[in-house]
């Protein structure tokens, strides 16, 4: 089956959610791990990741269609220390499949705002830190 990984971001007030979404077949969930790395150009692994999610096969989901699993990493307040390059990755211990999402970046600006760039088209996000609004 076709397995792919996408990265996205959303804001709720001052919180920034970084989301790694893996699309896979139901039976492929077992043994799959999704993880998010920062500033790891070559050695992004579950061990060096900021957060990881081990997928489990959900017997409650009927059919053999494609399903999605999400890892969400929430930053309560973005600070200059969060500036850097992030990447969503996944791997299967069963099949040996390795997935690497596109690199995306958080840039904290001198005005106290931050931008998230490198996401899918129409997902260049610019956030005003103090007001907590999407501009």
């Amino acid at each position: 089956g076709c397995i792919n990984i996408t990265s996205s971001a959303s804001q709720e007030g001052t919180r920034l959610n970084l989301i790694c979404t893996v699309w896979h077949k139901k039976e492929e969930a077992e043994g799959f791990v999704v993880f998010l790395c920062k500033d790891r150009s070559g050695d992004c692994s579950p061990e060096t990741s900021l957060k990881q999610l081990r997928l489990k096969r959900d017997p409650g989901i009927d059919g053999v269609g494609e399903i999605s699993s999400q890892l969400m990493f929430t930053i309560s307040q973005v600070t200059p220390l969060h500036s850097g390059t992030y990447q969503c990755c996944a791997r299967s211990q069963k099949s040996g499949i390795r997935l690497q999402g596109h690199f995306f970046s958080i840039l904290f600006t001198e005005t106290g705002n931050y931008t998230v760039t490198g996401l899918k088209q129409r997902q260049h996000l610019e956030f005003s830190h103090n007001e907590g609004t999407l501009s």
Epitope: L50, T79, P80, L81, G84
Partner: antibody
Framework: EVQLVESGGGLVQPGRSLKLSCAAS????????MAWVRQAPTKGLEWVAS????????YYRDSVKGRFTISRDNSKNTQYLQMDSLRSEDTATYYC????????????WGQGASVTVSS | EIVLTQSPTTTAASPGERVTITCRAS?????MHWYQQKPGASPKPWIY???KLASGVPDRFSGSGSGTSYSLTINNMEAEDAATYYC??????????FGAGTKLEIK
């Protein structure tokens, strides 16, 4: 178990230098931004400096800018604070602390290193 | 720079008493964190993001507030709660600031 162990403190004359070290263990050091927080005798806490996980970005409180330098060696799981042109008001216990990645709280602290600046 | 003012500076409470420590910010902040420090020991994160208890903190503690006014409350004071409590916030560009601390003693 997360452990942060500071060393390098001591008595130093005004205008002199001192370098503090903080040896970290029990977590993936290279993933975390680190900080130094100080506490003058019988006083409150004061943030001194922070460094990004990769070491490329550093931040300081105004009173130490140009005098103190924070750095780290991820291969040695150690962060440092080089303190130059020390003043009597820098006398304090200096704590090494980790930045929680998802929040702005300092979640792990070392036992502290005592620095006394006096002639 | 945002200034955090804690009150009272010192207070004493009897076992079983309800205690409230307040932290006022000179400008609005998004979250407040609280630390507990006992003599000769390092500070410990106690309450983070205004109301979340750190691991191992008894549920007699609670935190609340918004804007410029935040508080830490102990519902039934116990001897082991005697310590100094500090509030802390993050804001750009002043970065990390702490309150001067509230010393809580047991009667």
């Amino acid at each position: 178990e997360v452990q942060l162990v500071e060393s390098g403190g001591g008595l130093v004359q005004p205008g002199r230098s001192l370098k503090l070290s903080c040896a970290a263990s029990g977590f993936t050091f290279s993933n975390y931004a680190m900080a130094w927080v100080r506490q003058a005798p019988t006083k409150g806490l004061e943030w001194v400096a922070s460094i990004s996980s990769g070491g490329g970005d550093t931040y300081y409180r105004d009173s130490v800018k140009g005098r103190f330098t924070i750095s780290r060696d991820n291969s040695k799981n150690t962060q440092y604070l080089q303190m130059d042109s020390l003043r009597s008001e820098d006398t304090a216990t200096y704590y090494c602390a980790t930045h929680n990645y998802e929040s702005t709280v300092f979640d792990y602290w070392g036992q502290g290193a005592s620095v006394t600046v006096s002639s | 720079e945002i200034v955090l003012t804690q009150s009272p500076t010192t207070t004493a409470a009897s076992p079983g008493e309800r205690v409230t420590i307040t932290c006022r910010a000179s400008s609005s902040v998004s979250y407040m964190h609280w630390y507990q420090q006992k003599p000769g020991a390092s500070p410990k994160p106690w309450i983070y993001e205004t109301s979340k208890l750190a691991s191992g903190v008894p549920d007699r503690f609670s935190g609340s507030g918004s804007g410029t006014s935040y508080s830490l409350t102990i519902n039934n004071m116990e001897a082991e709660d005697a310590a100094t409590y500090y509030c802390q916030q993050w804001n750009y560009p002043s970065m990390y600031t702490f309150g001067a601390g509230t010393k809580l003693e047991i009667k």
